[in-house]
Amino acid sequence: IWELKKDVYVVELDWYPDAPGEMVVLTCDTPEEDGITWTLDQSSEVLGSGKTLTIQVKEFGDAGQYTCHKGGEVLSHSLLLLHKKEDGIWSTDILKDQKEPKNKTFLRCEAKNYSGRFTCWWLTTISTDLTFSVKSSRGSSDPQGVTCGAATLSAERVRGDNKEYEYSVECQEDSACPAAEESLPIEVMVDAVHKLKYENYTSSFFIRDIIKPDPPKNLQLKPLKNSRQVEVSWEYPDTWSTPHSYFSLTFCVQVQGKSKREKKDRVFTDKTSATVICRKNASISVRAQDRYYSSSWSEWASVPCS
Amino acid sequence: RNLPVATPDPGMFPCLHHSQNLLRAVSNMLQKARQTLEFYPCTSEEIDHEDITKDKTSTVEACLPLELTKNESCLNSRETSFITNGSCLASRKTSFMMALCLSSIYEDLKMYQVEFKTMNAKLLMDPKRQIFLDQNMLAVIDELMQALNFNSETVPQKSSLEEPDFYKTKIKLCILLHAFRIRAVTIDRVMSYLNAS
């Protein structure tokens, strides 16, 4: 058993049929010695008396808020949560496996630049009685500070018969140098509590590996005289690290109709302009990627050919 | 020791070209190592990230773009910083700092060159003959060093008398390649910045 936060405790259980469970001793936080009784949740049934209560925790029915009273007055609470371990593996029932970039990916994180700010998100089908708490650091043995905000519900989607909820959190490394060469990864830890179930999820990464620039901005077209060719120009996104001559991007320019299966014109360039062939009912799209360290491409920025 | 916005040395462009070749060569070599050594811990997640140049050179700091010298976090590890009060730096100081930066890059290359050559000598003794260093990568390191045109003492190639542990050597190769790729990215960024300045 360990303390998650004040008056909230996590009991780690090996979860299999007829498991013996864990013996837990609760102590009432009071100077009083006599006349103390214990109850669980809203029930008025007295579970025991005395300053300590020993219980055998085997299942979710044994978890919950234990309260010690004296003469009708509440003295203190202890909330017990369960963390299940099945076949030596901690349960991952609360969050959905995003399976990208690999199986057992519950947390996904992205950074728009090298400033040390990044966003992580996760998915669940659970809509109520759900709380998250996020901690992060650079390295684990001698951790350096990363400050994370509160996790918030950022999107709701319908997937078949199910609703899916996306939560996200923003974090900022306390003292980040954009030009630094990372040797210790960022660690992100998410505590998830659903009703009386506790689970924790972790992700470890270098900022350089989770870079995904914003799309290029200010796309403009200039038709070339006596030609079907069009000069398309754009600018670096505002959120990208500066100076741009140090943090350079490379671009992919594509002309394509509405369907992905349609024919297309595609060219890669390090410049902020390119010449392509425009077709009726097609769009010109441009996306960006770090020129020197190939992490993710940005989303497309698009303008219609006409 | 930060890079100011300065008139580029006319000989900078060949360095940019060589640094692009360097990044390409080390990236290819790293990819080859990850494929060939698939049953060894050779991915970014599996290895310890060591920097053989730590405390010996200070390329990131010496080559910091002027725009980043206002960032306290970039100056943390530096004993000296050449920020002046708002105005541009005198050209003498400019070329002095650029020289500091480029000589730091040169020293990095020299250290990695020695490590790689020593390692290759060990890998050539491996009866499995599983992996060797790409001669192209070693040649590209050499070309960039020549383009930088610094004279410095030759570092003797380390020779060891004991029987090499090939498993450890291959893991060391992965560690070295990952670190060198990261440094090659920095070098490429620096050359691009200098070329544009």
Epitope: E262, K263, R266, T269 | -
Partner: antibody, heavy 118, light 107 residues
Framework: QVQLVQSGAEVKKPGSSVKVSCKAS????????LHWVRQAPGQGLEWMGW????????EYAPKFQGRVTITADESTSTAYMELSSLRSEDTAVYYC???????????WGQGTLVTVSS | DIVMTQSPLSLPVTPGEPASISCRAS??????LHWYQQKPGQAPRQLIA???QSISGVPSRFSGSGSGTDFTLTISSLQPEDFATYYC?????????FGQGTKVEIK
């Protein structure tokens, strides 16, 4: 299976014209760009131009501008390349080729040998 | 026009050995570079798109690398069926241009 079948070999006199055809099967004809590339005996590949069969748009290499005409007939899924004012150095195998991507080629025809000789 | 220069023009290789062909562009073309293989009496066949993207159906022993002006096609272990002429082609700008070809011959 995508296939491009070209017309047979031709022998032409200098100053005349040649029209080579290329019939496509497998896939929708207008879903692809069609290119013409030639190869002189023992020489390398030389790009001549492309056509978008959907709208008839064409682009020619400056070297052939004014001498080459690429057309397409959607009803028969056939593309044509006509080269005029032939000279001996136009002796080559002429390939039609196609791709959904404009700037490179993934499927080639078998080639048509055009010999220009007096 | 962008001029593509291949080297060597002829490359004698022992079967089972690796081979590398170089292609250089007269100006920077990013990764807009494609590789083709041509056997005598046959049409070319696509091997690599955009400098390093493998094409389905092409054996994994063929790989490409490079960007800017310098590109390489590598065959990790030459098989008897790989003896052919190899061409690079730039797609950075029109007109599309090819290298002059590299003939890989049995040593």
């Amino acid at each position: 299976q995508v296939q491009l079948v070209q017309s047979g070999a031709e022998v032409k006199k200098p100053g005349s014209s040649v029209k080579v055809s290329c019939k496509a099967s497998g896939g929708t004809f207008s879903d692809y760009y069609l290119h013409w590339v030639r190869q002189a005996p023992g020489q390398g590949l030389e790009w001549m131009g492309w056509i978008d069969p959907e709208n008839g748009d064409t682009e020619y290499a400056p070297k052939f501008q004014g001498r080459v005409t690429i057309t397409a007939d959607e009803s028969t899924s056939t593309a044509y390349m006509e080269l005029s004012s032939l000279r001996s150095e136009d002796t080559a195998v002429y390939y039609c080729a196609r791709n959904k991507e404009l700037r490179y080629i993934d499927v080639w025809g078998q080639g048509t040998l055009v010999t220009v000789s007096s | 026009d962008i001029v593509m220069t291949q080297s060597p023009l002829s490359l004698p290789v022992t079967p089972g050995e690796p081979a590398s062909i170089s292609c250089r562009a007269s100006q920077s073309i990013s990764i807009n570079l494609h590789w083709y293989q041509q056997k005598p009496g046959q049409a070319p066949r696509q091997l690599i798109a955009f400098a390093s993207q493998s094409i389905s159906g092409v054996p994994s022993r063929f790989s490409g690398s490079g960007s800017g002006t310098d590109f390489t096609l590598t065959i990790s272990s030459l098989q008897p069926e790989d003896f052919a002429t190899y061409y690079c082609q730039q797609s950075n700008s029109f007109p599309l241009t090819f290298g002059q070809g590299t003939k890989v011959e049995i040593k």
